[in-house]
């Protein structure tokens, strides 16, 4: 078989790659193929670029032709111009180089023409019919930066094997575009995988510094790790950092992302900037500066108090009118002397009795033995040290008076970026498992989006929310999905609520925070995408799937179904996000699978119904959403979508957005 036609190959420089695909395609098919990989047909505009193309193509047979990104519409001859009326597929006619096979002839140019490059000789440009399936095509991929090829080390078993973001695998690269993976095999039997990533100080570089093939295991020099060294099952060494620190770009040292973080109240590692600021209970991030915290006026929440409410910095208090007294829940009012009787009558049999003693509470916790999972965007609640301000009373609501949570400002996920309180936030005092379900509330204002109800029958323990495990290899920033790594947590001890907490996986700088919805801005509109909910969590998700659009509703409404419940003074993001504390380095994430789990809605920034589409919406019909590489974990599998890589440097700057802008023009051309 023809060595020239065997496999695609590429030549990369510091800011772009050319790739040769020896596949017989028409011009349109070739153009689409390049676009689907995130590139464009090659546009060699300078002698230097042409030289790179020449070296890539080499000396093929005379019969071989390769499409490049030049085309001309019928009757568009401009023979005096360097490109003769041809236009690059990027939409312009700028060039400092041409290589036409023949001088321009003064014909009428009656038909559309496309340009192919000869694989032999001087790689001249020939024009011809765009519908011919020539022997191959040249793609060009632009990017923000590249990593130099790794130097071979003494302990290596062979050359590094590189995989580019456009799926070319080779050992023969001088430069590797951002997002490439290098696999190095060491003679000792272990190996290393490196990622070409953005560096905190700017530019790009490999995610680990050499040497990669060191001695055996962690024994010599702690494996080069600053904090912890872990010998993986496959024999290679990886470094980890103690809680509150993150792994630096070199993969060995550890850094404290909150050391210089300008957070007013609390700081937590993670997020694109390396840290996230949070506010204590009763406060929320300031709109003008998410690093600062401002008091939340809980009294603005409809139904927070049955009668009267007084707000103060960091909290609020309920009052009753004359002749009424505040019930034990701190919210309800009853005629003086009749306390408690009315409440239990109103609430009905489904709620527990308020007068339950401590032993009963212990038993209730022992009986609560569900697995813990987490859905993105659900309110976080967790026990911590006694907070500066905590609600000592727990609300009960009659059926017709449910707590209403106003539409959250888009500060959930919290704004990224003081004194570093150990990441214990002020938390709701909870002594019962909370059952959450979505119902139809009366919404307090026109700003509230519609809420879609989902009610569910009681489930046996067999049907409680299963644990979902999803493991992903390291991905470049543009491809990093929100990681949802879930495991069973220990049963909560008596008198403590289930811990709901998260620790984000270590991220390379410029990553979006995992677990956050994938928010991409198109024009002035923000579109939020969440990972899909696993399909096989019946009956919980079955009911949800039947009633909800592909993306969960835009508002969260809690319907409390226990007599003693935490009051959630506001659904402003600060309150829903104050309760983060780290868990083990295994990134465990827990959410109570209560004995009667109801639908777990997800909290989302507002988005118009028209945006409730698939998680990735290519703007051009020929674009394909990339799939996440996945190591299949235990069933059920969790399917996540990767966000599309954002367009970077020219010529891929046209990207999908450019296609949307020029779709009419492109469709007419192509």
């Amino acid at each position: 078989q023809d060595p020239w036609a065997a496999e695609p190959r590429a030549a990369c420089g510091p800011s772009s790659c050319y790739a040769l695909f020896p596949r017989r395609r028409t011009f349109l098919e070739a153009w689409r193929a390049c676009r689907e990989l995130g590139g464009d047909l090659a546009t060699p505009r300078t002698p230097e670029e042409a030289q790179r193309v020449d070296s890539l193509v080499g000396a093929g047979p005379a019969s071989r032709l390769l499409w490049i990104g030049l085309q001309r519409q019928a009757r568009q001859c401009q023979l005096q111009r360097p490109l003769r009326g041809f236009t690059w597929t990027t939409g312009d006619q700028d060039t400092a180089f041409t290589n036409w096979a023949q001088p321009a002839s003064g014909g009428p140019c009656p038909a559309q023409r496309c340009v192919a490059l000869e694989a032999s000789g001087e790689h001249r440009w020939l024009e011809g019919s765009c519908t011919l399936a020539v022997d191959g095509y040249l793609c060009q991929f632009g990017f923000e930066g590249a990593c130099p090829a790794l130097q071979d080390e003494a302990g290596q078993a062979g050359p590094a094997v590189y995989t580019t973001p456009f799926h070319l695998v080779s050992t023969e690269f001088e430069w590797l575009p951002f997002g490439s993976v290098a696999a190095v095999q060491c003679q000792a039997g272990r190996g290393a995988s490196l990622l070409c990533v953005k560096q905190p100080e700017g530019g790009v570089g490999w995610s680990r510094a050499g040497p990669l093939c060191l001695g055996t295991g962690c024994s010599p020099d702690n494996g080069g790790c600053e904090h912890e060294c872990v010998e993986e099952v496959d024999g290679h060494v990886s470094c980890r950092c103690t809680e509150g620190f993150r792994l630096a770009a070199d993969g060995r040292s550890c850094e404290d992302p909150c050391a210089q973080a300008p957070c007013e109240q609390q700081c937590e590692p993670g997020g694109p900037q390396g840290y996230s600021c949070h506010c204590r209970l009763g406060f929320r991030p300031a709109e003008d500066d998410p690093h600062r915290c401002v008091d939340t006026d809980e009294c603005q929440i409809a139904g927070v108090c049955q009668q009267m409410c007084v707000n103060y910095v960091g909290g609020f208090e309920c009052y009753c009118s004359e002749g009424h007294e505040l019930e034990a829940d701190g919210i309800s009012c009853s005629p003086a002397g009749a306390m408690g009787a009315q409440a239990s009558q109103d609430l009905g049999d489904e709620l527990l009795d308020d007068g339950e003693d401590e032993e009963d509470e212990d038993e209730a916790w022992k009986a609560f033995n569900g697995g813990w999972t987490e859905m993105p965007g659900i309110l976080w609640m967790e026990p911590t040290q006694p907070p500066d301000f905590a609600l000592a009373y727990r609300p009960s609501f009659p059926e017709d008076r449910e707590p209403q949570i106003p539409y959250p400002e888009p500060t959930w996920p919290p704004p990224l970026s003081a004194p570093r309180v150990p990441y214990h936030s002020s938390v709701l005092s909870v002594t019962r498992p909370v059952v959450v379900s979505a119902t139809h509330p009366t919404l307090p204002s026109a700003h509230q989006p519609p809420v879609i109800p989902a009610t569910h029958p009681a489930l046996s323990r067999d049907h409680q929310i299963p644990v979902i495990a999803a493991n992903y290899p390291d991905l470049p920033s543009a491809y990093q999905p929100g990681i949802l790594s879930v495991s069973h947590s220990a049963q909560p001890p008596a008198h403590q609520p289930p811990m709901i907490s998260t620790k984000y996986p270590e991220l390379f700088p410029a990553h979006q925070s995992p677990m956050f919805p994938d928010t991409r801005v198109a024009g002035t509109q923000t579109t939020t995408h969440l990972p899909g909910i696993p399909p096989n969590h019946a009956p919980l998700v079955t009911t949800l799937g039947a009633q909800l659009p592909p993306q969960a509703p835009d508002a969260l409404v809690l319907r409390t179904q226990a007599t003693q419940l935490p009051i959630i003074p506001t659904a402003q993001p600060s309150l829903t996000t104050t309760s983060r504390s780290p868990v083990s380095p295994a990134h465990q994430i827990s959410v109570p699978a209560a004995t009667q789990p109801a639908a777990l809605p997800t909290l989302l920034p507002s988005q118009s119904p028209t945006n409730q589409t698939s998680p990735i919406s290519p703007t051009h019909p020929h674009s394909k959403a990339p799939q996440i590489p996945r190591e299949d974990g235990p069933s059920p599998k969790l399917a996540l979508w990767l966000p599309s890589p954002a367009p970077t440097a020219a010529p891929t700057a046209l990207g999908e957005a450019g296609l949307a802008e020029h779709s009419q023009r492109d469709d007419r051309w192509l």
């Epitope: 028409t26 023949q102 011809g128």
Partner: antibody, heavy 124, light 108 residues
């Protein structure tokens, strides 16, 4: 100058295999694709398929798939056509033709040179 | 398969007449169309390639035009040596090369 010459038995028995040879000269054999076309008596032209001598890449007309085989011998600049299980319907003049690559700055895949043709009669 | 429908199937014209033959493709073939001339007992010869380009050594009285699905072949002034059968052919490679049925040109 470019020349293509077909040769082969003029008569083939039904159900047997028709074998033809096309010898090329006057150009670099591996630089150009070779097509096979046939023309039944008094009828139009019918494309059978092509082979690229550079890499043995072949594309056949669906009509002949399973019956047709095209081969090349680059050392002798020869292309071969084999058509198995022939019937009287396969009686035709068989041509080999060279696919052009480029003319005057244009790339093109039309057939620029043809052999004189070889009549094959299928009869018992 | 892409069908090439050629018309007329035959025509008679006088020497010096303008002769036009048309060919319609069943789908867009761009400009990947050739016109071939076959005189009785001979192999076909390439006259026009890429719909409108005259092949080397072909007299200027032969011309072609069209793109997409409709193509025209013209002999501007018919000569006695032009008596032959003319074929259109598409060669987009997908899914295969196909020929028109041919047009037999005769002198009145």
């Amino acid at each position: 100058q470019v020349q293509l010459q077909e040769s082969g038995p003029g008569l083939v028995r039904p159900s047997q295999t028709l074998s033809l040879t096309c010898t090329a000269s006057g150009y670099t054999f591996t630089d150009y694709v070779i097509h096979w076309v046939r023309q039944p008596p008094g009828r139009g032209l019918e494309w059978i398929g092509y082979i690229n001598p550079y890499d043995d890449d072949t594309t056949y007309n669906q009509k002949f798939k399973g019956r047709v085989t095209m081969l090349v011998d680059t050392s002798s600049n020869t292309a071969y056509l084999r058509l198995s299980s022939v019937t009287a319907e396969d009686t035709a003049v068989y041509y080999c033709a060279r696919r052009g690559n480029s003319y005057d700055g244009y790339f093109d895949y039309s057939m620029d040179y043809w052999g004189q043709g070889s009549l094959v009669t299928v009869s018992s | 398969d892409i069908q090439m429908t050629q018309s007329p199937s035959s025509l008679s014209a006088s020497v010096g007449d303008r002769v036009t033959i048309t060919c319609r493709a069943s789908q867009n073939v761009g400009t990947a169309v050739a016109w071939l001339q076959q005189t009785p007992g001979k192999a076909p010869k390439l006259l026009i390639y890429s719909a409108s380009n005259r092949y080397t050594g072909v007299p200027s009285r032969f011309s072609g035009s069209g793109s997409g699905t409709d193509y025209t072949f013209t002999i501007s002034s018919l000569q006695p040596e032009d008596i032959a059968t003319y074929y259109c052919q598409q060669y987009t490679n997908y899914p295969m090369y196909t020929f028109g049925q041919g047009t037999k040109v005769q002198i009145k």
